[in-house]
């Protein structure tokens, strides 16, 4: 078919025969080769493979292949090797992104923040504040905020409400007589109606681009209140009505129940800036890891809507 034939046509180039001064039209050499001898009135051009360390990407009429770029400077790694058909391409290794001709570590989203946008080899991670009903209890450059464990769905009660930095802590009630047994949908452990679990003071880091107005915005991570409680992945406890007990009160004879480890990469939906988005304007120096400072209250939250 004509179309196929056309697609196989080799381009041509013009060459001036030095001996005769005649302008000749020669066939180009394929990519990965160069013209080692030009055509004459009586002979075709001769193509040779590009020597090691050189390349040609396209069919050509050149007498020498292009030199490959210099070896990748540390900490960059080769994305494409230097070969007859390709120049060497450098990129940043996993966990880093290209910044000012070098590689910088992806920002670590602090406790209370999750990844809104994954980092790539060319773009930094974007962090977001964990929104209502979600939390992040480990600094990470890959994990999103996770929904609180749903204690009620497991026939448990909330012993300690979640914050943006910690999951709900679920437990069992002691056996009550039927007359005192709580009705479904009633929160056994609750906080004042006006208080959101995210309002509970807690220490937290401020990721790059999320500078706090406070002078010392970073904070050290506190150990979990109950180390045996693992991260839950079921959503928030506020689906039941809250009573008026003080936030710090706990019920007598409650038993803590270990939650099974759930998926780690829950995303949060943030509707407004944080609906799922994260840190934007970043300082030139990404956070390489958590910095230590003074404890402070929760950071901001975002209209957040991501989840797995």
């Amino acid at each position: 078919q004509p179309e196929q034939k056309a697609s196989n046509l080799i381009g041509t180039y013009r060459h001036v025969d030095r001996a005769t001064g005649q302008v000749l039209t020669c066939d180009k050499c394929p990519a990965g080769t160069y013209v080692s001898e030009h055509c004459t009135n009586t002979s075709l051009r001769v193509c040779s493979s590009c020597p090691v360390g050189t390349f040609t990407r396209h069919e050509n009429g050149i007498e020498k292949c292009h030199d490959c770029s210099q070896p990748c400077p540390w900490p960059m790694i080769e994305k494409l090797p230097c070969a007859a058909l390709t120049d060497r391409e450098c990129t940043c290794p996993p966990g880093m992104f290209q910044s000012n001709a070098t590689c910088a570590p992806h920002t670590v989203c602090p406790v209370g923040w999750g990844v809104r946008k994954k980092g790539t080899e060319t773009e930094d991670v974007r962090c977001k504040q964990c929104a209502r009903g979600t939390f992040s209890d480990v600094p990470s450059s890959v994990m999103k905020c996770k929904a609180y464990t749903d204690c009620l769905s497991q026939n448990l009660v909330v012993i300690k409400p979640g914050t943006k930095e910690a999951d709900n802590v679920c437990g069992t009630l002691p056996s009550f007589s039927s007359s005192t047994s709580p009705s479904p949908g009633t929160a056994i452990f609750s906080r004042p109606e006006h208080m959101d679990s995210h309002e509970v003071p807690s220490s937290t880091y401020v990721p790059k681009g999320m500078n706090s107005t406070e002078s010392n915005s970073s904070a050290s991570v506190r150990p979990k209140v109950l180390s045996s409680i693992q991260e839950g992945t079921v959503p928030d406890n506020t689906s039941s009505a809250r009573g008026k007990e003080d936030v710090n009160k706990t019920l007598p004879n409650l038993q803590v129940v270990n939650h099974q480890q759930g998926p780690h990469h829950r995303h949060i939906l943030k509707l407004l800036p944080s609906m799922e988005a994260t840190g934007g304007e970043k300082s030139s120096t990404p956070i390489k890891g958590p910095k230590r400072g003074h404890p402070r209250q929760n950071l901001h939250k975002h209209f957040d809507i991501n989840e797995h």
């Epitope: 809104r116 209502r132 995210h198 943030k270 509707l271 304007e281 950071l299 209209f303 809507i305």
Partner: antibody, heavy 115, light 110 residues
Framework: EVQLLESGGGLVQPGGSLRLSCAAS????????MSWVRQAPGKGLEWVSS????????LYADSVKGRFTISRDNSKNTLYLQMNSLRAEDTAVYYC????????WGQGTLVTVSS | QSELTQPPSASGTPGQWVTISCSGS????????VYWYQQLPGTAPKLLIY???QRPSGVPDRFSGSKSGTSASLAISGLRSEDEADYYC???????????FGGGTKVTVL
């Protein structure tokens, strides 16, 4: 009790400017992301812009990018939306909302862009 | 046109069960939490469901949310006259890098 109170709406000509404010009370304002969402007459909700608690990051809908600026003053517990180069299609009730989950909303302020 | 698709209207008689769907894609609902808002006539929207299926305190348990794949649903059981309102779903969109709302569903109690 969480309260958000918008103000600053009104009638403005195309190309004109307005500055909306949202006064917050009943919660620690500086801990929360805040957003603006609008609703044109008889239409649905449209997210406009958001800002982190510290003001460190801002996001804008494509429809307002370059014309609107969101900001906040945590010392005054107030969120702002500076609207420039207003167009007829910006006519709407503008709501401010708290948190990434938009768990609390103000009552809204009407912005009318008309000649 | 909204990134999230909702039916424009739904209706039922008192006591009936009504379901509102919200259809999206992998970049939004498929990979993010879904939120639902109720807007009673002449009032501001109110958070009804967050993180797919959680109710804020004060929201009756007649309202329930669920999510499966790239779609979400809001169910209202035991429909009441006071449930007559507009309902909006919302989520984050990874591709747009922005929050998105559904077009809204007007629920009428017959």
């Amino acid at each position: 009790e969480v309260q958000l109170l918008e103000s600053g709406g009104g009638l403005v000509q195309p190309g004109g400017s307005l500055r909306l404010s949202c006064a917050a009370s009943g919660f620690t304002f500086s801990n929360y992301e805040m957003s603006w969402v609008r609703q044109a007459p008889g239409k649905g909700l449209e997210w406009v812009s958001s800002i982190y608690s510290s003001g460190g990051e801002t996001l804008y809908a494509d429809s307002v990018k370059g014309r609107f600026t969101i900001s906040r003053d945590n010392s005054k517990n107030t969120l702002y939306l500076q609207m420039n180069s207003l167009r007829a299609e910006d006519t709407a009730v503008y709501y401010c909302a708290r948190d990434g989950a938009a768990d609390y909303w103000g009552q809204g302020t009407l912005v009318t862009v008309s000649s | 046109q909204s990134e999230l698709t909702q039916p424009p209207s739904a209706s039922g008689t008192p006591g009936q069960w009504v379901t509102i769907s919200c259809s999206g894609s992998t970049s939004n609902i498929g990979n993010n939490y879904v939120y639902w808002y109720q807007q009673l006539p002449g009032t501001a929207p109110k958070l009804l469901i967050y993180t797919n299926n959680q109710r804020p305190s004060g929201v009756p348990d007649r309202f329930s949310g669920s999510k499966s794949g790239t779609s979400a649903s809001l169910a209202i059981s035991g429909l009441r006259s006071e449930d007559e309102a507009d309902y909006y779903c919302a989520t984050w969109d990874d591709s747009l890098y922005a929050p998105v709302f559904g077009g809204g569903t007007k629920v009428t109690v017959l």
